[in-house]
């Protein structure tokens, strides 16, 4: 990437690392509003299977691991990058390391949720205080969970999905704050490991994954209210893997695997239509990407 | 029934390249994780290369890397090991073996293997 | 990368006999071993998995152990057919290695 500094623009979705052939140190950003992808300061170290979220303008990349020729290292890093200087910088490690993990964001603090080290499947979860930086651990999830899909809805932290170690999960769960305990709530109509999971609307929206058997194109979501889970226009392309963010109240899904191809394509769902459409592609294709978006 | 099935094996001069398959029936290579294992002759198990059905993730041996491809092919139900720049020590039958996750890795249906020999 | 110290590299045994091999990981692997029967000419067969777990269709006869980094393959009571090579393979983290084999001769 370019070591230039970032045009001072509005709202990004930032795509970091991935994997293609080995992990990547890629990060780039769309800007929705005229298409346009600008390629920005590489991750010091590659890694896929990372998460990504914003606190405070600040984007940060947490675990994941370097898979590359040279061997294959799961990560605890935590890395922040300024849009204002296009420069990482590291911060505390998490506990232990973390791939495939899934993180959200509640009142300025990070969550890193499940994730494996080895053959060890977290049920583990921490919280990073950025004013600190430190990482302190929270109850542990009631399930073991790696590519877990994790958002964060009315100050509660959801953990959706994922594969235990011996099986993938339909399984869902809720995380209290304020009580520092995890809830089971409904299980998915559908087996999802390494979907895409975000909130739009005041529902939890879970999309794609692999359930075993393929990977899948179907997207569900869940309303708090009705406490449901309820199926919503599927997406053109199957996948697992896959990078998601919503962006001006439609979600946006990168790239993932297919089961073939490392795909490049990104979609884009409107509520109000219950439709997906292809919006634009990445430079190039990739799963085990890390996404989120600037705030205004 | 599983079965899984080698071809492709053979004579091959130094710095040649091969290519190996793994048919397989009986289940879906997209429901597990492939690996290909390697035998010299007169000697141990040596793990080559894995792909990841979830992810598409591949990981190699470091004796191996850069000059080894594994791929799979869901469609035809198949998977590869496109093996480049081979050397003597890569002398081997090579066996694609399936691990169920559930196994912790642990590869519960093999080929019946396949040899490679690299000599001038 | 992790060591998977096997030993003994070769045994003599009667049918009938109680035969243990074991291996020693240079570090710690959890739980994440597995060991394999093979026989000249034929692809390894799995016997166990998760350092204890008996695979399915294998006799009851085989059993898994571990004692921290230690782990143990028992035969309880030899049969003719259990003659061959024993491997040991980890799998908790990358690369994933084997034993050098213990090879189980008829006395």
């Known amino acids: 990437g370019s070591m230039g500094h970032a045009p001072k623009v509005g709202r990004l979705i930032y795509t970091a690392g991935g994997y293609f052939r080995q992990s990547l140190s890629y990060l780039e950003a769309y800007n929705p509003s005229d298409g346009t992808w600008l390629d920005l300061a590489d991750l010091q170290v590659p890694r896929s299977g990372l998460a990504g979220c914003v606190v405070g303008g600040l984007l940060y990349a947490v675990g994941g691991r370097n898979n590359s020729p040279d061997g294959n290292t799961d990560s605890s890093a935590l890395d922040c990058y300024n849009p204002m200087t296009n420069q990482w910088s590291p911060c505390a490690p998490m506990s232990v390391p973390r791939n495939r993990i899934g993180v959200g964001v509640i009142d300025g603090h990070i969550y890193a949720v499940g994730g494996s080290h080895g053959c060890i499947h977290h049920n583990s979860v921490e919280r990073y205080e950025p004013e600190r930086d430190e990482w302190h651990l929270v109850a542990p999830m009631l399930t073991r969970r790696i590519g877990v899909g994790v958002a964060v809805l009315n100050r509660l932290l959801y953990a959706v999905g994922g594969f235990d170690g011996t099986n993938r999960l339909n399984s869902a769960e809720c995380y209290y704050p304020e009580r520092n305990e995890w809830r089971m709530i409904t299980a998915m109509n559908t087996i999802r490991s390494g979907a895409g999971v975000c909130v739009l609307h005041n529902c939890i929206y879970a999309a794609g994954g692999y359930d075993g058997q393929d990977q899948l194109n179907s997207v569900e979501r869940y309303d708090v209210e009705t406490e449901t889970w309820t199926f919503v226009a599927p997406m053109k392309h199957r996948r697992s893997a896959l990078g998601i963010t919503v962006h001006q109240g439609r979600i946006y899904v990168l790239g993932g695997y297919d089961g073939h191809t490392f795909l490049d394509s990104v979609e884009c769902y409107d509520p109000d239509t219950d439709t997906w459409s292809e919006v634009t592609r990445m430079t190039s294709g990739r799963s085990g990407v890390g996404v989120a978006v600037t705030m205004e | 029934e599983v079965q899984l099935v080698e071809s492709g094996g053979g004579l091959v001069q130094p710095g040649g390249s091969l290519r190996l398959s793994c048919a397989a029936s009986?289940?879906?290579?997209?429901?597990?994780?492939i690996h290909w294992v390697r035998q010299a002759p007169g000697k141990g198990l040596e793990w080559v290369a894995s792909?990841?059905?979830?992810?598409?993730?591949?990981l190699y041996a470091k004796s191996v890397a850069g000059r080894f491809t594994i791929s799979a092919d869901t469609s035809k139900n198949t998977a590869y090991l496109q093996m480049n720049s081979l050397r003597a020590e890569d002398t081997a039958v090579y066996y694609c073996a399936r691990a169920e996750s559930g196994n912790v890795a642990a590869a519960d249906y093999w080929g019946q293997g396949t040899l490679v020999t690299v000599s001038s | 990368d992790i060591q998977m110290t096997q030993s003994p590299s070769s045994l003599s045994a009667s049918v009938g006999d109680r035969v243990t091999i074991t291996c020693r990981a240079s570090q710690s692997v959890s739980s994440a071993v597995a060991w394999y029967q093979q026989k000249p000419g034929k692809a390894p067969k799995l016997l166990i998995y998760s350092a204890s777990s008996l695979y399915s269709g294998v006799p009851s006869r085989f059993s898994g152990s571990r004692s921290g980094t230690d782990f143990t393959l028992t035969i309880s009571s030899l049969q003719p057919e259990d003659f061959a090579t024993y491997y040991c393979?980890?799998?908790?983290?990358?690369?994933?290695?084997f034993g050098q084999g213990t090879k189980v001769e008829i006395k």
């Open positions: 792909i990841d059905p979830e992810t598409g993730e591949t």
């Open positions: 393979q980890q799998s908790y983290s990358f690369p994933s290695t």
């Open positions: 009986g289940f879906a290579i997209s429901a597990s994780s």
